[in-house]
């Protein structure tokens, strides 16, 4: 049959409709929306009203798989997969539809939160225009003689801070990685601080086709787990591979957030800072952020 079977694993929003019989929905993690009164009109998008002490709360019961199959939502946010988009729609009780497969090209500067921004589906578009998709901070110069993607990235103001990139090359500063990625219109990620060495296996450094070691900024990307680790740290889900550059990634069940336990000599949210550096690097397919 052409249609996928019902109830493939976890709960991609099938539970509330009664379709996902493969797991007990009541045992799933509950993500509460901000709705105070719960009824059919206020608890939509796969939410179910659940008793909570005195009253009812809208619960979003989604056990999302973490396969990286990005979709662009009508609010302009990129989601790790369609399940995360549905979960965000439920959590915020706001319609979010898939407008395109793949990441949203337009960069609204958002981080890895859960998509609080308002957005009209009509206003969201992927940057195609005459140039085709211009990615990695490139802009479409439609007035130029040879129409194409133009990179206006100025790295002259950055100090010497060498990094090794996924193309096997050393760059004098992460800004130059971003510039190269923009010029070549292909994914180039930072693998580590410092020049590339002989021990860096270029076959593992992730050429253009190496399968996205780092993901673009995605909304609602925390992985809800069925395992009971309440109050404990647990290993990060596989979708956060590479989240900690020089350290160990730990997932805090109670907050559904990832944190890094840094190796000696490194600090920062992603263990990306050295004692002598103010460099802040967020490896991403789409951008590099400097603070």
């Amino acid at each position: 049959s052409n249609q996928p079977p019902g109830g493939g694993g976890g709960s991609g929003g099938d539970c509330p409709g009664g379709k996902g019989k493969s797991i007990n929905c009541s045992e799933l993690n509950v993500r509460e929306s901000d709705v105070r009164v719960c009824d059919e009109s206020s608890c939509k998008y796969g939410g179910v009203c659940k008793e909570d002490g005195d009253g009812l709360k809208c619960a979003c019961q989604f056990q999302c798989h973490t396969n990286y199959i990005p979709v662009c939502g009508s609010n302009g946010d990129t989601y790790q997969n369609e399940c995360f988009l549905r979960r965000a729609a439920c959590k915020h009780q706001k319609e979010i539809t898939v407008i395109a497969r793949g990441p949203c090209y337009s960069d609204n500067g958002s981080g890895s939160g859960e998509g609080e921004e308002e957005g009209s589906g009509a206003e969201v578009h992927r940057k195609h225009s005459k140039c085709g998709p211009c990615k990695y901070k490139a802009e479409c110069d439609e007035d130029a003689e040879n129409v194409g993607c133009v990179c206006n990235i100025d790295c002259s103001g950055y100090s010497f801070n060498p990094v090794c990139a996924s193309d096997g090359s050393s760059y004098n500063n992460p800004c130059f990685v971003r510039e190269a990625s923009c010029i070549k219109q292909e994914q180039i990620d930072i693998r580590h601080l410092g020049h590339c060495t002989d021990t860096d296996d270029t076959s593992l450094l992730g050429k253009k086709d190496d399968g996205l070691q780092y993901r673009p900024d995605v909304k609602d990307a925390s992985d809800q787990r069925e395992d009971v680790y309440i109050g404990n740290h647990m290993p990060c889900p596989e979708n956060l591979n590479g989240y900690c550059i020089h350290g160990k990634c730990e997932f805090i069940y109670s907050t559904q957030k990832a944190s890094c336990r840094c190796e000696s000599g490194y600090t920062g949210q992603h263990c990306e800072k050295t004692d002598f550096s103010i460099l802040y690097v967020v490896p991403s397919r789409q951008k590099l952020t400097h603070v």
Epitope: P5, G9, G10, H65, D227, E238
Partner: antibody, heavy 121, light 107 residues
């Protein structure tokens, strides 16, 4: 009915390249992620790679990263596996398989019959 | 990467016996687990997905259970046609790793 037909297998020397194809029919190709799975003679199944829907999201098993490239041509309903720098341990029957992943995720409901790749000097 | 470990690697049982195969994931995978049957010289066939959901056309003597890290495939009454190698597979995220397989034979 759903059909997946692999081709391109054969005998090849170590270090050389080979390109496998998988022709799909009987379903909406763009609605499925397409995978390669291999099985060395007398051994178990090993997942090799996946390419999702539009073709930009791809993942590989560590042992083939940097050597194999998975791709798809949605206009031709065809999946490819470009295998470079082949090694003796790549000798296996290579299967293509389809899987749906969206709001929910499902494993392989259809497989091809497989094509044998032998890497030998 | 998450490892999938199957046990036993092989077993021999009589027709009519209840057979149990286990699969353990090195980290929790919710219920994103599938079981396949592969008969000698044949292509693998999906038996169970979502840990416990029987694929269409699969005999009801096959059942699956478990969630998180520990999973079980049970054949309630072994039949001669069940001689095969059985594989578990995780599919919550790449890589979609298989277990090493369990070979089932008739005594």
């Amino acid at each position: 009915q759903v059909q997946l037909v692999e081709s391109g297998g054969g005998v090849v020397q170590p270090g050389r390249s080979l390109r496998l194809s998988c022709a799909a029919s009987g379903f909406t190709f763009t609605s499925y992620g397409m995978h390669w799975v291999r099985q060395a003679p007398g051994k178990g199944l090993e997942w090799v790679a996946v390419v999702w829907y539009e073709g930009s999201s791809k993942f590989y098993v560590d042992s083939v990263k940097g050597r194999f490239i998975i791709s798809r041509d949605n206009s031709k309903n065809t999946l490819y596996l470009q295998m470079n720098s082949l090694r003796a341990e790549d000798t296996a029957v290579y299967y293509c398989a389809r899987a749906y992943c969206g709001g929910d995720c499902y494993p392989f409901d259809y497989w091809g019959q497989g094509t044998l790749v032998t890497v030998s000097s | 990467d998450i490892q999938m470990t199957q046990s036993p690697s092989s077993l021999s049982a009589s027709v009519g016996d209840r057979v149990t195969i286990t699969c353990r994931a090195s980290q929790g995978i919710s219920n994103y687990l599938a079981w396949y049957q592969q008969k000698p010289g044949k292509v693998p066939k999906l038996l169970i997905y979502a840990a416990s959901t029987l694929q269409s056309g699969v005999p009801s003597r096959f059942s699956g259970s478990g969630s998180g890290t520990d999973f079980t495939l049970t054949i309630s009454s072994l039949q001669p046609e069940d001689v095969a190698t059985y594989y578990c597979q995780k599919y919550n995220s790449a890589p979609w790793t298989f277990g090493q397989g369990t070979k089932v034979e008739i005594k």
